[in-house]
């Protein structure tokens, strides 16, 4: 008789990452009988919500439902109907909403209320929408990449099943860059974490981890650019800002009111004799780099060593996965290869930033001009942040791996968040069963 496959006994979970510049919906799937095994959860779908981040809907909260419709419908299509009611849905909002909450707790609550109402209309098991802390964002990103890299598995293997695997159980550090914040998370080597705010203790699969993490609010790539513009316009002699972080020939008018809209530029705010100014690109990597360094206060450190702005940072240890905008920007610039040295990256950035704007527009006709115009800044910012901010060197650069996906799942905080909320990472190592359940009869 022919063997017949039993219906798959699988579970699904949905996490929405409500970031500062956009929202993404992730659908995860795992075998029901292997919930506590490491590495069994994988991403089956990413749906990028069409439009900006949810914080932009503050003046039109009643439209958040429309904005979310398409991706929620996608989830309805991908997940079998019989599973809808038991599929948990979580929404985590990050730094864009942290900034909105700093401006007005009431407005942030109103946005989240409407998000909750909209998501409750779907047939899934909605578990809530909340603004996650920067510490959580860092921690869950670290859990995600190490879970996907198989670092929590106690079984040693003679073969590598995932890229970057070094066949030891040493965890990877996590470097996450968003639009409004950036996170650094890793296990320091025998180093006490001098600042309690930056210390996390985990027991995962029977092993203890002492983890360092920090989230730098306002140091995501978009908010860092606003900071830089606000800083530079202070010393401009008129309403023309000659900016080395934009390509030669690039021109853009900026409203001063937009510049000072974000809490991130408050420290640079001043009364200017004009309502608008014009950015004129001059495309000079070195000058751009110098301007960016002025955003990092390295003159004050109350600890044995700091990143910047007086924030404790232990000596870097081991390999790091750099994901989210670290990956997207470097991928665009074609700089994600393991073989590209830091010197080579710097060299390529010098060339890229110096290219005339008209030439860049022709070469990348399919890219929206707003995004395209900012790659010179973003690439330079990534180098500045990693080298001067986090103290990577030309030698330790090779320990940074720019990662988009691992085993088909996006690197980011969402998987770690779901694993935690569904209790799928046990503190103790699960007892291994002698035989796996057969799917055939």
């Amino acid at each position: 008789t022919q063997n017949k496959a039993l219906p798959e006994n699988v579970k699904y979970g949905i996490v929405l990452d409500a970031g500062s510049s956009h929202t993404s919906l992730y659908i995860y799937k795992w075998p029901a009988e292997k919930e506590n095994d490491t590495g069994v959860v994988h991403q089956v779908e990413e749906c990028r919500v069409k439009g900006p981040g949810i914080s932009k809907f503050v003046q039109k909260v009643n439209e958040i439902g429309i904005y979310l419709t398409d991706c929620m419908e996608r989830a309805r299509e991908v997940i079998p109907r019989s599973q809808h009611q038991e599929t948990p849905v979580y929404l985590g909002a990050t730094a864009g909403m942290r900034l909105l909450r700093m401006e007005s707790e009431e407005l942030a609550d109103r946005v989240l209320d409407v998000v909750e109402r909209s998501l409750s209309n779907y047939p899934f098991d909605f578990q809530g929408a909340r603004i996650i802390t920067g510490q959580e964002e860092g921690a869950y990103g670290w859990i995600t990449i190490n879970y996907l890299l198989g670092k929590f598995s106690q079984k040693t293997r003679w073969f590598s099943i995932v890229p970057y695997e070094t066949n030891n159980q040493e965890t990877f550090g996590a470097l996450d860059l968003g639009g409004a914040s950036t996170q650094v998370t890793f296990v320091p080597q025998n180093q006490t974490i001098e600042s309690p705010d930056n210390a996390l203790q985990f027991r995962l699969y029977g092993k203890d981890y002492n983890v360092y993490t920090h989230s730098f609010l306002c140091y995501g790539k978009d908010q860092a650019l606003w900071q830089k513009l606000a800083k530079d316009i202070q010393v401009a002699s008129n309403e023309i800002l000659r900016d080395p972080c934009f390509h030669p020939g690039y021109k853009k008018v900026v409203n001063v009111s937009d510049l000072y809209k974000t809490p991130c530029t408050k420290r640079f705010e001043m009364t200017l004799p004009f309502q608008q100014f014009e950015i004129q690109g001059i495309g000079n990597y070195q000058q751009c780099h110098q301007s960016i360094l002025e955003l990092f206060n390295t003159s004050y450190c109350p600890y044995s060593q700091c990143a910047f702005n007086g924030i404790f940072l232990p000596p870097l240890q081991g390999d790091f996965g750099a994901f989210s905008a670290f990956y997207f920007v470097m991928k665009f610039l074609n700089l994600t290869s393991e073989k590209v040295s830091q010197e080579k990256v710097t060299e390529m950035m010098k060339k890229f930033c110096a290219q005339p704007w008209e030439e860049i527009k022709t070469s990348y006709a399919g890219v929206k001009e707003k995004y395209l115009s900012e790659y010179c800044f973003s690439g330079t910012y990534i180098l500045s942040l990693l080298l001067q901010g986090y103290h990577f060197t030309a030698d330790s650069w090779e320990h940074i791996h720019f990662i988009g996906k691992i085993q088909g799942s996006d690197a980011g905080w969402t998987l770690g968040y779901m694993l935690n909320l569904t209790n799928m990472i046990p503190a103790e190592q699960p007892l291994s069963t002698p035989l796996s359940h057969s799917t055939y009869v």
Partner: antibody, heavy 121, light 106 residues
Framework: EVQLLQSGPEVVKPGATVKISCKVS????????LNWVKQPPGKNLEWIGN????????RYNQKFKGRFTITIDQSINTAYMELRSLTSEDTAVYYC??????????????WGQGTMLTVSS | EIVLTQSPAILSPSPGERVTLNCSAS?????MHWFQQKPGQAPRLWIY???NLASGIPARFSGSGSGTEYTLTISRMESEDFAVYYC?????????FGQGTKLEIK
């Protein structure tokens, strides 16, 4: 500003295959779903399907599934719709369009000028 | 699929008159969108998300409704408003349009 430029009118014989195109400019191609809509002469609008250039995923109205295929070429910011085994019932204006929220959360909805397809022996 | 039924099919209002167009859905939808189409032209978004006027649409137009019943109202009909109006739901796939209401000159 967003622009959608469709290929010109087509006159084909029954049973033939045709591929109409929609070239978009003024926005990042992967940011929005691209939809196709059919309108026979003097009749109503019917949604055919769409494609998400970000993921490459497609959705179709069951009525059009099978004979109609939506694809994209990201390198030239162009979406295509191929129609196979054509009959006189396929004579219509075909529109491409996209909608959604821009960076400032303003809703927009843009359509191409339409491609007239005539199926006649 | 969600079937949208528009009524009336044809209406012949006089300029200055108040006009109400209806759109009924076979099952509940979250929002309704309305389009105007003139001969030889592509449809143009007129009202989105039930009650929001699209960019450049005159304030004499308004939209309302919820669940399965939606309306588009013109407070004072003007000559440029003669056209076909379609409702559309984007709440679930497949996306569907109503069969249209034609506003024609008497």
């Amino acid at each position: 500003e967003v622009q959608l430029l469709q290929s010109g009118p087509e006159v084909v014989k029954p049973g033939a295959t045709v591929k109409i195109s929609c070239k978009v400019s003024g926005y990042s191609f992967t940011d929005y779903n691209l939809n196709w809509v059919k309108q026979p002469p003097g009749k109503n609008l019917e949604w055919i399907g769409n494609i998400d250039p970000y993921s490459g995923g497609t959705r179709y109205n069951q009525k059009f599934k099978g004979r109609f295929t939506i694809t994209i070429d990201q390198s030239i910011n162009t979406a295509y719709m191929e129609l196979r085994s054509l009959t006189s019932e396929d004579t219509a204006v075909y529109y491409c369009g996209l909608y959604g929220y821009d960076d400032d959360a303003n809703y927009f909805d843009d359509w191409g000028q339409g491609t007239m397809l005539t199926v006649s022996s | 699929e969600i079937v949208l039924t528009q009524s009336p099919a044809i209406l012949s209002p006089s300029p200055g008159e108040r006009v109400t167009l209806n759109c009924s859905a076979s099952s509940s939808v979250s929002y309704m969108h309305w389009f105007q189409q003139k001969p030889g032209q592509a449809p143009r978004l007129w009202i989105y998300a039930t009650s929001n006027l699209a960019s450049g649409i005159p304030a004499r137009f308004s939209g309302s409704g919820s669940g399965t019943e939606y309306t588009l109202t013109i407070s004072r009909m003007e000559s440029e408003d003669f056209a076909v109006y379609y409702c559309q739901q984007r709440s679930s796939y497949p996306l569907t349009f109503g069969q249209g209401t034609k506003l024609e000159i008497k």
